[in-house]
Interface confidence: medium
C-alpha cells in the first residue's frame, strides 16, 4: 500500500500568505506573483546575478512537528541559465542551499544563521535557457530531501541564495504514515513511518470480525517502512466457519449455504438431501431418513442405508452352494456398499434350526464382502439351509432397520467323494476316498463301481464302510474306470468323478504307490 502523506507545510497552497522571513530584509528573496495557465501563482524569487557575493536567506515560518519523526521536503523551483544574462554574469550561480533548524519555540523574526544545519545543495536537473525564458517556458525542477529523526517541538527550513536566479514555486513539507490497511482479513492501524531507513516497524494486525488465525498459522503482522509503505506481510486470518470472504470482510453464509471450517474457500450450497440452512450455517442438517457418517465431509450429500440386494440365487452343487446376488437398486447415495452373509440350518425331521457359521466354510470372509458372490461348502446332506445376504453402507450403523434378502436351499446329497489311487500291481488297484467330516456321520456305506475301459457291458461293485478298498483279480496293464458313491439311509449320495487307473504291466512287477 502506498504511503500516506501528512502535510505540515504547503507554500503553493497558501496563496502567498505565509509571510516568510527574508534576510537581509528587503534584499535578495522577494515574494512575487505571476500568471501560469491563467492562474495567479506566488513564488519566492531572487535574481541578484550581477552583484557579486550573495548571501540571501529565506526562512519559513515555524512548523509544528507533531508526531512526525522523519520529514520529507519537496521543492519545485526554476533556475535560469547563467549564460542567458548579458556578459555571462561571472558571479552567477545555478544552485542554492537547503537548511533546517529544530526548536521548541517560535523565534519569530529573530533569525540566526548559526542555528541552521545544511541539508543539501539543491541543483536543477534542467536550467531555463534564454530561448525558454523568452518563450516563457518554465523549466520546473522537483527535488525531494528528507531529514530525521526530529526530536524538538517544531522546525524551520531555510533557503540560502549565493547568487543564482531562482524561483521557489512550491515548498511542501510532509511526513509519511503507513495507512490504515485491511489485508489478509487483518486490520493494521495507521502507523507513523519510522525515521531510520534500514529499520522496519513491526505492527501486529487484528483479525476482522468473524475471522480467526487458522490453527497452527502465524498471527498477522506487517512492517511499516520509512517511506510509509507496508512491507513483508506475515500470517493471515481466515473467515471462521459459517462465514466467507467478501472483499475485505467476513460475511455470514447466506441461507441455504454453509462453511464448516475456517478456510479460504467460499460458502458452499447445502448438498442434496439436507434441510435449508439458516444464515451463518457451519453445516446443513440432513433430511429425515438421511444421515451423515462420521467421516463424511459436510459438503457431501446426506445419504441413507441401501435397499436389500436386488436378486439373490442359491445354486446347490452337492454339499456346496454358490450364492449370487445383484447390488441394491437404491445405493442410498453412497458407494461404500458391503455385504454380509449369514447362514441358518434346519433339521427336516425335528424342524429345529440354528446358526451354522461354525460348521460351514466360505470361499472368503462372509462379512464386509465387496463382491456379489460367495461359495459355501462343507454343507451337511439332507439339511435345509437359509442364507441371508445383507447390504450395508457407511450410514447403516445409524439405523436399526436392516436391508437383506434370503435364499433357502436343501442339501439332499452328500458331497462327491474325493478319490485317490493309493497303490497298484499287475492285478490290483488300491483306492481311497474322503468326504467332509460333517457328512461322514450320515454315510452308511460306500459303493465302489469299476469296469474295464471300453467294456460297457459288464461292471463290478464293491461295498465297504471304510474309506479304502483294494480291487483284486484285475487284468495286467489294463485301464479301469473307477467311481465311488456314498450311500445314506435316504438313498444314494453324489457320485465321485469317474477316474481312470491302470494296472502295471508284467515287466513292472511289485506293489507301487502312486
Amino acid at each position: 500500500a502506498q504511503g500516506k502523506e501528512v502535510v505540515l507545510l504547503d507554500f503553493a497552497a497558501a496563496g502567498g500568505e505565509l509571510g516568510w522571513l527574508t534576510h537581509p530584509y528587503g534584499k535578495g528573496w522577494d515574494l512575487m506573483q505571476n500568471i501560469m495557465n491563467d492562474m495567479p501563482i506566488y513564488m519566492y524569487s531572487v535574481c541578484n546575478v550581477m552583484s557579486g557575493d550573495q548571501d540571501n536567506w529565506l526562512r519559513t515560518n515555524w512548523v509544528y512537528r507533531g508526531e512526525a519523526e522523519r520529514i520529507f521536503i519537496e521543492l519545485k523551483f526554476t533556475v535560469r541559465d547563467c549564460n542567458s544574462f548579458p556578459g555571462g554574469a561571472s558571479s552567477c550561480k545555478e544552485t542554492f542551499n537547503l537548511y533546517y533548524a529544530e526548536s521548541d519555540l517560535d523565534y519569530g523574526t529573530n533569525f540566526q544563521k548559526r542555528l541552521f544545519t545544511k541539508i543539501d545543495t539543491i541543483a536543477p536537473d534542467e536550467i531555463t535557457v534564454s530561448s525558454d525564458f523568452e518563450a516563457r517556458h518554465v523549466k520546473l525542477n522537483v527535488e525531494e530531501r528528507s531529514v530525521g529523526p526530529l526530536t524538538r517541538k517544531g522546525f524551520y527550513l531555510a533557503f540560502q541564495d549565493i547568487g543564482a536566479c531562482v524561483a521557489l514555486l512550491s515548498v511542501r513539507v510532509y511526513y509519511k504514515k503507513c495507512p490504515e490497511l485491511l489485508q489478509g482479513l487483518a486490520h493494521f492501524p495507521e502507523t507513523i513511518a519510522g525515521s531510520d531507513a534500514p529499520s522496519l516497524a513491526t505492527v501486529a494486525g487484528t483479525c476482522v470480525d468473524h475471522a480467526v488465525v487458522p490453527p497452527g498459522g502465524e498471527e498477522p503482522r506487517m512492517h511499516c517502512a520509512v517511506d510509509g509503505e507496508w512491507l513483508v506481510p506475515i500470517g493471515q486470518c481466515l473467515c471462521q466457519a459459517g462465514y466467507e470472504k467478501v472483499e475485505d470482510a467476513c460475511q455470514a453464509c447466506s441461507p441455504g449455504f454453509f462453511k464448516f471450517e475456517a478456510s479460504e474457500s467460499p460458502c458452499l450450497e447445502c448438498p442434496e438431501h439436507t434441510l435449508p440452512s439458516p444464515e451463518g450455517a457451519t453445516s446443513c442438517e440432513c433430511e429425515e431418513g438421511f444421515f451423515r457418517a462420521p467421516q463424511d465431509p459436510a459438503s457431501m450429500p446426506c445419504t441413507r442405508p441401501p435397499s436389500a440386494p436386488h436378486y439373490l440365487t442359491a445354486v446347490g452343487m452337492g454339499a456346496k452352494v454358490e450364492l449370487r446376488w445383484t447390488p441394491p437398486q437404491d445405493s442410498g447415495g453412497r458407494e461404500d456398499i458391503v455385504y454380509s452373509v449369514t447362514c441358518e440350518q434346519c433339521w427336516p425331521e425335528s424342524g429345529e434350526c440354528g446358526p451354522c457359521e461354525a460348521s460351514v466354510r466360505y470361499s472368503e470372509p462372509p462379512h464386509g464382502l465387496t463382491r456379489t458372490s460367495v461359495t459355501v461348502s462343507d454343507l451337511e446332506p439332507h439339511m435345509n439351509y437359509t442364507f441371508t445376504v445383507e447390504a450395508r453402507n457407511g450410514v447403516s450403523g445409524l439405523v436399526t432397520s436392516r436391508s437383506f434378502r434370503t435364499a433357502s436351499v436343501s442339501i439332499n446329497q452328500t458331497e462327491p467323494p474325493k478319490v485317490r489311487l493309493e497303490g497298484r500291481s499287475t492285478t490290483s488297484l488300491s483306492v481311497s476316498w474322503s468326504i467332509p467330516p460333517p457328512q461322514q456321520s450320515r454315510v452308511w456305506k460306500y459303493e465302489v463301481t469299476y469296469r474295464k475301459k471300453g467294456d460297457s457291458n459288464s461292471y463290478n461293485v464293491r461295498r465297504t464302510e471304510g474309506f479304502s478298498v483294494t480291487l483284486d483279480d484285475l487284468a495286467p496293464d489294463t485301464t479301469y474306470l473307477v467311481q465311488v458313491q456314498a450311500l445314506t439311509q435316504e438313498g444314494q449320495g453324489a457320485g465321485s468323478k469317474v477316474h481312470e487307473f491302470q494296472t502295471l504291466s508284467p515287466e513292472g512287477s511289485g506293489n507301487l504307490a502312486v
Partner: antibody, heavy 128, light 107 residues
C-alpha cells in the same frame, strides 16, 4: 535619449529583395529585444518579426515566414530585416521597435513583448 | 492566432470628455495587453502595458483595465493632444497581434 533610425526602404518590383537596417543609440542595445512592425497605407499595425537580445530566439508572423529574416549585430548596435520574394501586400511603413530586456532579471518571466521604443519608420513599396 | 477586436472603430469627442475604448481577445490573454497611441505620419507610442500599468512619462489621465478577454482604455479628461488612433496589442503568445485601431476625432 533612446533613438531608433530605420533605413533601406524604397521601391522594389514583386519578387525582388530589400534589406532594412535599424541603427540604435542612447541605450545598451544588447539588453534589448528588438522587433519589426509594419503598417500598410491607411491600415493598422502588424507585427512582423522579433529577435532576442543575444540574437535568439527569432519569431515571424505567418505572412512573412520563409521570406524574411531578422538579424542583429550587437557590436554595431544595428538590427536588420532581409526581405526576399517581395509581394505587393508587403507594401508598408516598416518600424523598428524595442523592449528593454533588463526588466528580465527575474527567475520566471512575465511576457514582456510590448514595444517601449519605436523608430520613425521606412516605407517599402512593392510594385511593378 | 489570437484575434484582437477593438470598438468602436472611431469616435467623436470633445475636449474634457471621458472616453473609453474596449478591446476583446478571441481567447484569454491574462493581463498581457498593451495600448499604443499613434498620430498621423508618426510612430506609435506606448501608453499602457500589462493591461493597467502606465508607461513612464504617460499622463495619468490614461488608465487601463481588464483581464482575460475584455480590456478597456479610458481617457478621463480628453486633451487636444489626445486626438489620435489608439491600438491594443496582445503579447500572450509569440504571434503578436494588434487590434484594428480606434480613431478618436474632435467633435
Amino acid at each position: 535619449e533612446v533613438q531608433l533610425l530605420e533605413s533601406g526602404g524604397g521601391l522594389v518590383q514583386p519578387g525582388g529583395s530589400l534589406r532594412l537596417s535599424c541603427a540604435a543609440s542612447g541605450f545598451t542595445f544588447s539588453h534589448y529585444m528588438m522587433a519589426w512592425v509594419r503598417q500598410a497605407p491607411g491600415k493598422g499595425l502588424e507585427w512582423v518579426s522579433r529577435i532576442g537580445p543575444s540574437g535568439g530566439p527569432t519569431h515571424y508572423a505567418d505572412s512573412v515566414k520563409g521570406r524574411f529574416t531578422i538579424s542583429r549585430d550587437n557590436s554595431k548596435n544595428t538590427l536588420y530585416l532581409q526581405m526576399n520574394s517581395l509581394r505587393a501586400e508587403d507594401t508598408a511603413v516598416y518600424y523598428c521597435a524595442g523592449y528593454d530586456s533588463g526588466y528580465d532579471y527575474v527567475a520566471v518571466a512575465g511576457p514582456a513583448e510590448y514595444f517601449q521604443h519605436w523608430g520613425q519608420g521606412t516605407l517599402v513599396t512593392v510594385s511593378s | 492566432d489570437i484575434q484582437m477586436t477593438q470598438s468602436p472603430s472611431s469616435l467623436s469627442a470633445s475636449v474634457g470628455d471621458r472616453v473609453t475604448i474596449t478591446c476583446r481577445a478571441s481567447q484569454s490573454i491574462s493581463t498581457w495587453l498593451a495600448w499604443y497611441q499613434q498620430k498621423p505620419g508618426k510612430a506609435p507610442k506606448l501608453l499602457i502595458y500589462k493591461a493597467s500599468n502606465l508607461h513612464t512619462g504617460v499622463p495619468s489621465r490614461f488608465s487601463g483595465s481588464g483581464s482575460g478577454t475584455e480590456f478597456s482604455l479610458t481617457i478621463s479628461g480628453l486633451q487636444p493632444d489626445d486626438f489620435a488612433t489608439y491600438y491594443c496589442q496582445q503579447y500572450n503568445v509569440y504571434s503578436r497581434t494588434f487590434g484594428q485601431g480606434t480613431k478618436v476625432e474632435i467633435k
